[in-house]
């Protein structure tokens, strides 16, 4: 009984199309596949950033695969050929591994790359990124930001830099069409007359860095002798009501502080008839139904009632 063997895929490589971390892994069928003409060959691909403990594994019938990587580190990948049992009239067969690596040759020392990169997607409308220059770099150093997400033909450079002392320290992005719920890739590189500057790569999803506007139109309504309903409206902009969580801070008579987190634009507060003053503020954040993370808005303007009988009227700002 001859043992059936199959070769690994040929010409396995990682190709960088210039998308700042979104890479193509590609290969060719193994040699001597003639024996398995009636057979659908599959490939098991394992890949990771160097230093990561776990491999990502996929099985595909294709000769290519695409995924995002952290270009601050190297990438390693391996692939082998898989023959289902139908190909061999027995048990499944797998080839040895073909392996490849990819990394961007780093220029400059790590300290020269930008520090404290921070990106915020204001009100799910305006993306702004800011950074500090690298440690010990001279004033002639300038940084340039490039970005890409699926849907763009190629990486684009920032066209509206925020400057300080002639240096680029941030970027105001233009309107980013169909850019949420997908990986957003950024590279900040630099140039200096004196020394090479290390590039930095960042990846995030825009819906996870949203900072909404604060809620508006805060009002009070007496519901009963011991209940007051606090109400507010969602901030103006594209974020739907179903995407908000709210945090409320309530002060009664300058003493009691109540904080609560709610999903709706109302909160019912138990009070006594002796309450002389009531103030509250609200802030908003994108919730778990619309994102994996988010940034709290600023607090709303304070809305207060004082000195009048809450049971007599509805209180508006």
């Amino acid at each position: 009984d001859t043992e059936i063997k199959v070769n690994p895929p040929q010409d396995f490589e990682i190709v960088d199309p210039g998308y700042l971390g979104y890479l193509y892994l590609q290969w060719q069928p193994p040699l001597s596949l003639d024996h398995f003409k009636e057979c659908t060959v599959e490939y098991e691909l394992k890949y990771r950033n160097i230093g990561s403990e776990t491999w990502k594994t996929i099985i595909t019938k294709n000769l290519h695969y695409k995924d995002g990587f952290d270009l601050n580190k190297g990438i390693e990948a391996k692939i082998h050929t898989l023959l289902p049992w139908q190909c061999t009239n027995g048990s499944e067969v797998q080839s040895s591994w073909a392996e490849t690596t990819y990394w961007i040759s780093p220029q400059g020392i790590p300290e020269t790359k930008v520090q404290d990169m921070d990106c915020v997607y204001y009100n799910w409308q305006y993306l702004l990124c800011s950074w500090k220059p690298g440690i010990g770099v001279l004033l002639d150093t300038n940084y340039n930001l490039f970005y890409w997400y699926e849907g763009l033909d190629h990486a684009l450079q920032c066209v509206d830099y925020i400057k300080a002392d002639g240096q680029n320290i941030g970027c105001r992005f233009p309107y980013l069409e169909a850019s949420d719920y997908k990986d957003f890739y950024i590279c900040v590189n630099g140039s200096s007359e004196n020394k090479p500057i290390r590039s930095s790569y960042f990846t995030f999803q825009l819906q996870n860095i949203v900072k909404p506007l604060p809620p508006v139109y805060l009002t009070f309504t007496r519901e009963s002798s011991c209940e007051i309903k606090l109400k507010w409206s969602i901030p103006l902009g594209p974020i739907p009501a179903r995407c908000f969580d709210y945090e409320i801070e309530i002060r009664e008579d300058d003493t009691t502080l109540v904080t609560a987190t709610v999903e709706n634009e109302t909160y019912t507060l138990k009070t006594t008839n002796e309450t002389r003053q009531l103030c509250f503020v609200v802030r908003s954040k994108v919730n778990i139904y619309c994102s994996d993370d988010g940034i709290w808005s600023e607090w709303s303007d304070k809305q207060c009632w004082e000195g009048e009988d809450l049971s007599k009227k509805t209180l508006l700002r």
């Epitope: 659908t40 599959e42 098991e44 594994t57 996929i58 099985i59 595909t60 019938k61 294709n62 695969y65 289902p84 049992w85 139908q86 027995g90 048990s91 499944e92």
Partner: antibody, heavy 121, light 108 residues
Framework: EVQLLESGGGLVQPGGSLRLSCAAS????????MTWVRQAPGKGLEWVSA????????YYADSVKGRFTISRDNSKNTLYLQMNSLRAEDTAVYYC??????WGAGAFDYWGQGTLVTVSS | DIQMTQSPSTLSASVGDRVTITCRAS??????LAWYQQKPGKAPKLLIY???SLESGVPSRFSGSGSGTEFTLTISSLQPDDFATYYC??????????FGQGTKVEIK
Amino acid sequence: EVQLLESGGGLVQPGGSLRLSCAASGFTFRRPAMTWVRQAPGKGLEWVSAITGSGGSTYYADSVKGRFTISRDNSKNTLYLQMNSLRAEDTAVYYCVKVRYGWGAGAFDYWGQGTLVTVSS
Amino acid sequence: DIQMTQSPSTLSASVGDRVTITCRASQSISSWLAWYQQKPGKAPKLLIYDASSLESGVPSRFSGSGSGTEFTLTISSLQPDDFATYYCQQYDTYPPITFGQGTKVEIK
């Protein structure tokens, strides 16, 4: 005639464990890949896990990775799913499924009748 | 992950109608697509594999077509036994294997 018969479902508390079994007959069990597919009440189909014919390779959905373990005993013609750290969202009918063609998955040509797993306190 | 999107979600039809259900993949899956029929309280049943191959024992009024990202399941003349929920499934690249959300074919 191909038959797949699941067992082991039932009511379990959140954080608890359960082991599903699937007794197979009517085909050479050691050859095809096998999978588990689940269906939450009133919802669609969700692939859970797959295992190759030899049992040498296993694959999992992200939602169960690290909590569920698929295995098979080819001498007993039986497929297993060990489910640990169960959550309310694992409540579903679990189907044992034979892969028609392919290494670890493909079109699913035979399905068991399903066993209901309910995770509730 | 490859997303599978079926349309419509619900389809009202009469016996004898020609019925078409569409399945769209978020990226090309060649012809690695299957269609299933599921009746309430029962396990799904394979109808079509490799986008257009009819599973043994399935009536010839069922047919599948398409490749790449667009696929259709057609029932040439709807029979009373065909009122059910239909699912598409890709097996081009996994894990995960992914299914469409289902299309319920109900009596008009």
